[in-house]
């Protein structure tokens, strides 16, 4: 018994005066607590606790279940204990089969012994299976067997407490270890869509998926810069042992413009927190914005190809797209496709492929697109660079020789006279009148130039060349004169020579 100094409160004394007592099943247990301020006896084994207010604890016929710690406490709160083993060959273990272990922590397999003198107190796998190689344990006959640093891999491990009695191995009832995982990473959060675009009155519904090792992960939807509690609904699933999924769905049944903003799905566990955001934009009506990918004024050489390309944003989805030229709709030569296959995509591309353009195909090409709310259009002015074409070459009633040429850029007309039957026209003739005409006849983009010279200046047989040229090329036409007496006569224009 402990010795104490006089005057100081001392713990009670117990008879018999030893720390451990072994009795046989059926024998009497008699324990006496001596203390002037005796309060109570307490008996503890596993989760069971009993009290006795008498200073002598008597169990007439001891059973294995009377094995445990008997503690006497006085009025000063001081106590003394004795551990009693009730040896029962038929019941070597007292068991509490509930067995939970937190990952990376120690856990106790509660199978205290009724006989401390048995040997080889340890753990064994069920049905003869070996225990995991890395499983370490410490046996304690009074408490059970402590498994050190529980691993996630031990989850659902079936095991027995085991002792050797008289050379034979005796097993306890089986235990199933349930491992509670430790949070070793932040929760994984994802959102059904990163952004939402809605019209007023439409329903906004967004789902956040939270994944973690257990259901004790916390999650909530928050609106950035707002403390308002949001209405959310939950669904959850366990996919296997350490794969928990929760879906938190936020709904606004009739969205308004002022509901626009950033919504955050927040989740945390003991390791840390994670979040993901989605952006809601609510517009009062749909829209279409068109962005030309090339200059809307296009210069292209005769015979070359050009692609007219636009990108456009359309919400709601575009319903009708068309390319128009000269009030006629293209049925082919164009394609329209979404910029991305993303479900929330509102950006589209339309391409008109113009191949081997002719000078007559310059003009305004218009892209039109509409959805249920709006229409939009963009026009491209296409100028086809063409070498001059001589439209007409006439001798007028007033004696003028008139040459009209069309091309782009604007042609220049020069005049030359070749006397007699010479092949080379070198003597230049100054025009009397040069005009750039309004292009009502030839198509858009071509510029028409009309130049005139006075044919009365020519006194000899010969050929007059009208030469039209620009940056792209040159073209000539010839007018042949022959004099018959005093009359000047035009003779067959292509009979004189080939230019």
């Amino acid at each position: 018994q402990p010795s104490v100094s006089p005057g100081e409160p001392s713990p009670p004394s117990i008879h018999p005066g030893k720390s451990d007592l072994i009795v046989r099943v059926g024998d009497e247990i008699r324990l006496l607590c001596t203390d002037p301020g005796f309060v109570k006896w307490t008996f503890e084994i596993l989760d069971e606790t009993n009290e006795n207010k008498q200073n002598e604890w008597i169990t007439e016929k001891a059973e294995a279940t009377n094995t445990g710690k008997y503690t006497c406490t006085n009025k000063h709160g001081l106590s003394n204990s004795i551990y009693v083993f009730v040896r029962d060959p038929a019941k070597l273990f007292l068991v509490d089969r509930s067995l939970y272990g937190k990952e990376d922590n120690d856990t106790l397999v509660r199978c205290p012994l009724t006989d401390p003198e048995v040997t080889n107190y340890s753990l064994k796998g069920c049905q003869g299976k070996p225990l995991p190689k890395d499983l370490r344990f410490i046996p304690d006959p009074k408490a059970g067997i402590m498994i050190k640093s529980v691993k996630r891999a031990y989850h659902r491990l079936c095991l027995h407490c085991s002792v050797d009695q008289e050379g034979k191995s005796v097993l306890s009832e089986k235990f199933i270890l349930k491992v509670r995982p430790a949070f070793k990473a932040v929760p994984v959060v994802s959102v059904s869509k990163a952004s939402y675009l809605l019209r007023e009155g439409e329903e906004f519904t967004v789902t956040c998926t939270i994944k973690d090792v257990s259901s004790s992960v916390y999650s909530t939807w928050k609106r950035e810069n707002s403390q308002t509690k949001l209405q959310e609904k939950y669904n959850s699933w366990h996919h296997g042992d350490f794969n928990y999924e929760r879906q938190a769905t936020l709904t606004i049944s009739s969205a308004r413009v002022n509901d626009s903003g950033v919504f955050m799905c927040y989740a945390n566990n003991t390791f840390g927190s994670a979040n993901v955001t989605t952006t809601l934009e609510v517009v009062d009506k749909g829209f279409i914005n068109i962005f030309p990918m090339i200059n809307t004024t296009v210069f292209v050489n005769d015979g070359e190809n050009v692609d007219l390309i636009v990108e456009y944003e359309a919400f709601p989805k575009p319903e009708h797209q068309q390319w128009i030229y000269m009030n006629r709709t293209f049925t082919d030569k164009w394609e329209d496709y979404p910029k991305s296959e993303n479900e929330s995509n509102i950006r589209y591309v339309s391409e008109l492929h113009l191949t081997r353009l002719k000078g007559t195909e310059g003009g305004t090409y218009t892209f039109l697109v509409s959805n249920s709310d709006v229409n939009a259009a963009i026009a491209f002015n296409v100028y086809v660079n063409t070498k001059p074409e001589i439209l007409t070459y006439d001798r007028l009633v007033n004696g003028m020789l008139q040459c009209v040429a069309a091309g782009f850029p604007e042609p220049t007309i020069d005049w030359y006279f070749c006397p007699g039957t010479e092949q080379r026209c070198s003597a230049s003739v100054l025009p009397v009148d040069v005009q750039t005409l309004n292009s009502s006849g030839p198509p858009f983009g071509k510029l028409v130039v009309q130049s005139s010279i006075d044919s009365s200046a020519f006194k000899h047989n010969g050929t007059v060349e009208c030469k039209a040229y620009n940056d792209v090329g040159k073209t000539s036409a010839y007018f042949n004169f022959a004099f018959k007496g005093n009359n000047k006569e035009q003779i067959h224009p292509h009979t004189l020579f080939t230019p």
Partner: antibody, heavy 122, light 108 residues
């Protein structure tokens, strides 16, 4: 000598298509603009279309614009007229004709083919 | 207006002179050309420019112009001259050629 020979015309139902061709010889085909002119039964001459000497430019009468296409193949010395969405009023003898002045698109027509009859009737 | 107007029919005694006329605004500036068309045949150019004849066209055919009127004259008409005659000129406000309605010449 200059010769222009049109292909056989034929009968077509309204809304259908027909293609005429005109084979040229006796001159430098690639130097001259070529025209199509038509003449409805018992009526006068009506200019239809022209293609410039190199085929880079085409012009049409308002009555056929958007339905008829003139083209040429200088390597084959052949002129074509593709007639789509035919109407009863397109019934006529179709002549191909050569421009008189080398390199000039519009002007007098100095040689004509013998003509081919196109009948549009249901 | 881009129209050329011709008398529908003219007759002439064999060997006499006949004049066919063509009226239109474009003729104030541009010369008319004239085409002869016999039944079942293609048109043939007979006069172009101020008064020019393609090779093979007899010199009894001549052209003239005054104001908005162009004329085709046959001096000493022959039986083979019986045909339809079309005048042709540049369209005002355009470049293509337009044709008159045609004159039917009968040689008596």
């Amino acid at each position: 000598q200059v010769q222009l020979v049109e292909s056989w015309g034929g009968v077509a139902q309204p809304g259908r298509s027909l293609r005429l061709s005109c084979a040229a010889s006796g001159f430098t085909f690639s130097s001259f603009a070529m025209h199509w002119v038509r003449q409805a039964p018992g009526k006068g001459l009506e200019w239809v279309a022209v293609t410039s000497y190199d085929g880079s430019n085409e012009y049409y009468a308002d009555s056929v614009k958007g339905r008829f296409t003139i083209s040429r193949d200088n390597s084959k010395n052949t002129l074509y007229l593709q007639m789509n969405s035919l109407r009863a009023e397109d019934t006529a003898v179709y002549y191909c004709a050569k421009a008189m002045v080398r390199g000039v698109t519009f002007g007098d027509l100095d040689y004509w083919g013998q003509g081919t009859l196109v009948t549009v009737s249901s | 207006s881009s129209e050329l107007t011709q008398d529908p029919a003219v007759s002439v005694a064999l060997g006499q002179t006949v004049r066919k006329t063509c009226q239109g605004d474009s003729l104030k500036s541009y010369y008319a050309s004239w085409y002869q068309q016999k039944p079942g045949q293609a048109p043939v150019l007979v006069i172009y420019g101020e008064n020019s004849r393609p090779s093979g066209i007899p010199d009894r055919f001549s052209g003239s112009s005054s104001g908005n009127t162009a004329s085709l004259t046959i001096t000493g008409a022959q039986a083979e001259d019986e045909a339809d005659y079309y005048c042709c000129s540049r369209a005002t406000g355009g470049y293509h050629r337009i044709f008159g309605g045609g004159t039917k010449l009968t040689v008596l």
